[in-house]
C-alpha cells in the first residue's frame, strides 16, 4: 500500500550505548522523507527527526526519560516535497522497529582505568565511573548511578612477562589485588551485567601497566 | 536449553597431543566465561583452566601451563582445549562448564557431559 | 594459591539423617564459594552458590552458610538419591580451586 512513490522504511535498528541511543533503517531516500514516532507500551507517540531525510534519529532524550520502560518506534514515509500525502489507506506509510527496553539492551561502553596505586604487595585499581546521559534531578547520572549492583567490573590483571590473565570482580568502582613484589603488572577491565541474557559484557579498557603515568608506586 | 557437549577424547600416547572441543547451545558463549576441569580416575576435581571468549583471556592450572591451550569461536559458539605433550597424569575426564556471576561471585553452573582422555604407551 | 580444605573425606549416614559438610579456605574468599554435587560417572551439578544461595532446581533441604573462610554444606534430611560425592569451590581468586571431596555413603 502508500503512494507509487514513497517505500516503507526497512531493517529498523537500535544502536545504544551507555544509554546514547539512536534508531537507524534503510532505505537511504529518493524523493522521500522520514518521520519518526517514539512510544512506551502504554504512552502516546511522540514525533521526533521530522521530515528528514537522514536513516538514522537521536532518540536519547526520550528514553533516558525512564530507562527501564519498553519503547516501541516506527519510522513514517512522505514524498519529498509533499509531506501531506498519505497511503491508500489514508496513512502514510510506516514500520514498526523491534522493542527495546534500554536499562535490558544498551549495550555496556568500553570503561577507563582511572588509575592504579601500589602499596606493598597490594594494587588499587579505580575505574571511571562514565556519566551517561540519564538525568535526576537536573544531574547526570553515572553509569553506577543507573545500574547500581547490577554492574559489575572484571578486572584481568597479569605480569607484563606472562600471557595468563587472573580475574578479580568488584561492584564498585575499585579493585583491590595481591601481586608479587617486584613485578610489573598490566591491567585491563570489563564492564558486566550478570543479570542480563544479551549484552552482558563491554569490550575491554584500554591495556594499562605498572611503570606508566597512570600509576603511582609506593614501597612499604 | 543450556547444553555444552565435549567432544575429541581418546587414546594418546605420551608426548601426543589431543584438541578437545565443547559445543555450546542454548546460550551464546561470548557472554560467559567457559571453564574446563578434569578429574581422573578415582580422584576429585581439578580446575584447568578458563577463557573469556569474547576477549580472549585466559589461565591456567601450573600443572598444564605451557602445554594446554583454551581458545574459542565464537561463530561456533564452541571452545577448545588444545593439549600438547600430552604426560600419563593427564589421563582424566575433562569437562568443560559455563561460568555465571552472581554480583561478583562466579560459580559452574552448566556442565558438559565429560570426554576421557587417557594417555598411555 | 588458595587452598580449600573438605572434611570428612568421607561418611557414612542414613537416609533422615542430618549431614554437615565444611570446607575452610586458606585466606579470606569472601563469599566466592561454591558446592557441587556429582555422581558416579556423571557430571558435577551445583547446588549452592554465593556461600548460601540454592541454585534453581535443587530442593531446599540443601543449604550453605559461612563463618569467616568457613563454609558448610548442610543436607538437612538425607534422601537416597543424595548419596554421592560433595566438593566445594572457591572462585574468589585465580586460580580457582576445589576441595578434595565428601563422599557420603549409605551407612
Known amino acids: 500500500s502508500g503512494t507509487t512513490n514513497t517505500v516503507a522504511a526497512y531493517n529498523l535498528t537500535w544502536k545504544s550505548t551507555n544509554f546514547k541511543t539512536i534508531l537507524e533503517w534503510e532505505p537511504k531516500p529518493v524523493n522521500q522523507v522520514y518521520t519518526v514516532q517514539i512510544s512506551t507500551k502504554s504512552g502516546d507517540w511522540k514525533s521526533k527527526c521530522f521530515y528528514t531525510t537522514d536513516t538514522e534519529c537521536d532518540l536519547t532524550d526520550e528514553i533516558v526519560k525512564d530507562v527501564k520502560q519498553t519503547y516501541l518506534a516506527r519510522v513514517f514515509s512522505y514524498p519529498a516535497g509533499n509531506v501531506e500525502s498519505t497511503g491508500s489507506a489514508g496513512e502514510p506509510l510506516y514500520e514498526n522497529s523491534p522493542e527495546f527496553t534500554p536499562y535490558l539492551e544498551t549495550n555496556l561502553g568500553q570503561p577507563t582505568i582511572q588509575s592504579f596505586e601500589q602499596v606493598g604487595t597490594k594494587v588499587n585499581v579505580t575505574v571511571e565511573d562514565e556519566r551517561t546521559l540519564v538525568r535526576r534531578n537536573n544531574t547526570f547520572l553515572s553509569l553506577r548511578d543507573v545500574f547500581g549492583k547490577d554492574l559489575i567490573y572484571t578486572l584481568y590483571y597479569w605480569k607484563s612477562s606472562s600471557s595468563g590473565k587472573k580475574t578479580a570482580k568488584t561492584n564498585t568502582n575499585e579493585f583491590l589485588i595481591d601481586v608479587d613484589k617486584g613485578e610489573n603488572y598490566c591491567f585491563s577491565v570489563q564492564a558486566v551485567i550478570p543479570s542480563r541474557t544479551v549484552n552482558r559484557k563491554s569490550t575491554d579498557s584500554p591495556v594499562e601497566c605498572m611503570g606508566q603515568e597512570k600509576g603511582e608506586f609506593r614501597e612499604i | 536449553e543450556v547444553q555444552l557437549v565435549e567432544s575429541g577424547g581418546g587414546l594418546v600416547q605420551p608426548g601426543g597431543s589431543l584438541r578437545l572441543s565443547c559445543a555450546a547451545s542454548?546460550?551464546?558463549?561470548?557472554?560467559?566465561?567457559i571453564h574446563w576441569v578434569r578429574q581422573a580416575p578415582g580422584k576429585g576435581l581439578e580446575w584447568v583452566g578458563y577463557?573469556?571468549?569474547?576477549?580472549?583471556?585466559?589461565y591456567y592450572a601450573d600443572s598444564v601451563k605451557g602445554r594446554f591451550t583454551i581458545s574459542a569461536d565464537t561463530s561456533k559458539n564452541t571452545a577448545y582445549l588444545q593439549m600438547n605433550s600430552l604426560r600419563a597424569e593427564d589421563t582424566a575426564v575433562y569437562y568443560c562448564?559455563?561460568?555465571?556471576?552472581?554480583?561478583?561471585?562466579?560459580?559452574?553452573?552448566?556442565w558438559g557431559q565429560g570426554t576421557l582422555v587417557t594417555v598411555s604407551s | 594459591d588458595i587452598q580449600m580444605t573438605q572434611s570428612p573425606s568421607s561418611l557414612s549416614a542414613s537416609v533422615g539423617d542430618r549431614v554437615t559438610i565444611t570446607c575452610r579456605a586458606s585466606?579470606?574468599?569472601?563469599?566466592?564459594v561454591a558446592w557441587y554435587q556429582q555422581k558416579p560417572g556423571k557430571a558435577p551439578k551445583l547446588l549452592i552458590y554465593?556461600?548460601?544461595f540454592l541454585y534453581s532446581g535443587v530442593p531446599s533441604r540443601f543449604s550453605g552458610s559461612r563463618s569467616g573462610t568457613d563454609f558448610t554444606l548442610t543436607i538437612s534430611s538425607l534422601q537416597p538419591e543424595d548419596f554421592a560425592t560433595y566438593y566445594c569451590?572457591?572462585?574468589?581468586?585465580?586460580?580457582?580451586?576445589f576441595g578434595q571431596g565428601t563422599k557420603v555413603e549409605i551407612k
Open positions: 562448564a559455563r561460568a555465571d556471576y552472581y554480583g561478583v561471585d562466579e560459580f559452574l553452573d552448566y
Open positions: 542454548g546460550f551464546t558463549i561470548s557472554g560467559y566465561w
Open positions: 577463557i573469556d571468549p569474547y576477549n580472549g583471556a585466559t
Open positions: 585466606q579470606d574468599v569472601n563469599t566466592a
Open positions: 554465593s556461600a548460601s
Open positions: 569451590q572457591q572462585h574468589y581468586t585465580t586460580p580457582p580451586t
